[in-house]
Interface confidence: medium
């Protein structure tokens, strides 16, 4: 009779993570009598996966009933496969011996490759806000995929970016891999509503790339522009001065009015109006009692935006003469863009 052969018909098996791997093995003879064992790897460091004779192997089930006397099918199924299960599996026939069974014949081995999906890409931006015209860096990370081959792309508002660097680790063989990419993005004043997207494509995703996003609203700071204007006289001795704070983001803003360098009023932006581009406008006004001043008045609108150093704009009220009586204010003469003569 021909000597027993152990046949593993599949050179390789490809399984998705989480699924069940079937490793096929048959023997050509019932003789010699003895159990089958499955190992991952060869040599002294090999790992026991299944022992027909003894042991507890909760993830392993046999395809056929190994207790039947004429059984020659020693195929096994390994459940809930992870990338760590990748490797070459050997079906090994042992001959019954005393006191220990003796290894008799091994199959040629089946290489188990595990396909694992990448995790959802996580995009993170800079820790501190930056202003338009500055270049900021975004990072994208995804982990746990196999095989190593992967594609990563960056987009800003749907337009593909080219200024980025990507690394896949580790460089050598591994059960699973990670990808790390850094993209550089130049901010513009219109970027409050913009998005940066990192897209990862992998064989396991089958045409459905994974995307991670970052909103530039969390990255950008658009500093305000200030304009101080004098409104027509509201009452005989009162002048209304407004400070227009335009096109700022984020909303966090505090405004202080100074009269000749002395704090007159401080307020926080509350009822702002939003522009189409996502920036905000706000207006504050100050009612100045001219008769209380003997000299010219320098009005300053000072704005502290998002914790940045204050910016300011000034306006001069020129007090040229004082009324002899309360009711003798008659007119306001415009002598320049920032100057008013009050009579």
């Amino acid at each position: 009779e021909e000597e027993l052969q152990v046949i593993q018909p599949d050179k390789s098996v490809l399984v998705a993570a989480g699924e069940t791997a079937t490793l096929r093995c048959t023997a050509t003879s019932l003789i010699p009598v003895g159990p089958i064992q499955w190992f991952r790897g060869a040599g002294p460091g090999r790992e026991l996966i299944y022992n027909q004779k003894e042991g507890h192997f909760p993830r392993v089930t046999t395809v056929s009933d190994l207790t039947k006397r004429n059984n020659m099918d020693f195929s096994i199924r390994i459940g809930n496969i992870t990338p760590a299960d990748a490797g070459t599996y050997y079906c090994v026939k042992f001959r019954k011996g005393s006191p220990d069974d003796v290894e008799f014949k091994s199959g040629a081995g089946t290489e188990l490759s595990v396909r694992a999906k990448p995790s959802a890409p996580v995009v993170s931006g800079p820790a501190a806000r930056a202003t338009p015209q500055h270049t900021v860096s975004f990072t994208c990370e995804s982990h746990g995929f196999s095989p190593r081959d992967i594609t990563l792309k960056w987009f800003k508002n749907g337009n593909e970016l080219s200024d980025f660097q990507t690394n896949v680790d580790p460089v050598g063989e591994s059960v699973s891999y990670s990808i790390h990419s850094t993209a550089k993005v130049v901010l513009t004043r219109e970027d409050v509503h913009s998005q940066v997207i990192c897209e990862v494509a992998h064989v396991t995703l089958q045409g459905d790339p994974l995307r991670g996003t970052a909103n530039l609203s969390e990255t950008i700071r658009v500093p305000p522009t200030l304009e101080v204007t004098q409104q027509p006289v509201r009452a005989e001795n009162q002048v209304n001065v407004t400070c227009q704070v335009r096109k700022f983001y984020p909303q966090r803003l505090q405004l202080t009015w100074l009269e000749n360098g002395n704090v007159s009023r401080t307020e926080t932006a509350s009822t702002v109006t939003e522009n189409k581009d996502g920036t905000y406008n706000w207006m504050s006004w100050l009612l100045v009692n001219v008769s209380a001043h003997r000299d010219d008045v320098k009005l300053t609108c000072q704005v502290e935006h998002d914790g940045q150093p204050a910016v300011s704009k000034s306006h001069d009220l020129k007090v040229s003469a004082h009324p002899k009586e309360q009711g003798s204010n008659t007119a306001a003469e415009n002598t320049g863009s920032n100057e008013r003569n009050i009579y």
């Epitope: 494509a201 992998h202 064989v203 995703l205 089958q206 045409g207 459905d208």
Partner: nanobody, 126 residues
Framework: QVQLVESGGGLVQPGGSLRLSCADS????????TGWFRQAPGKEREGVAC????????KYTDSVKGRFTISRDNAKKTVYLQMNSLKPEDTAVYYC???????????????????WGQGTQVTVSS
Amino acid sequence: QVQLVESGGGLVQPGGSLRLSCADSEFRLDEYATGWFRQAPGKEREGVACISRSGSNTKYTDSVKGRFTISRDNAKKTVYLQMNSLKPEDTAVYYCAADLTSHYLSCSSYTDYNSWGQGTQVTVSS
């Protein structure tokens, strides 16, 4: 290897409709991006439509846009091609194919697809 089987082809008059189906003998078609291709006599095989694994991404060749719709029912592990307003130039053998290796959905290159069915004949004639 995935074994694909197409059905639903036949003879139809211009302006008519047909619905092609593609199933997998091993019931694994829900795992793969899938495409429909066609080959007319004496012409090269061309991509018609393709659909990603989840069905959320689809692509069409320009000549069938607005007339053909690709869809999938992953519970039934089947991919469909609904063909409306058929023209004589749509006459061809239609093949279903699974893309087991690509990162992105592509219908243009049939070399990306590595598991094919035997094809079903679609003839548009009055």
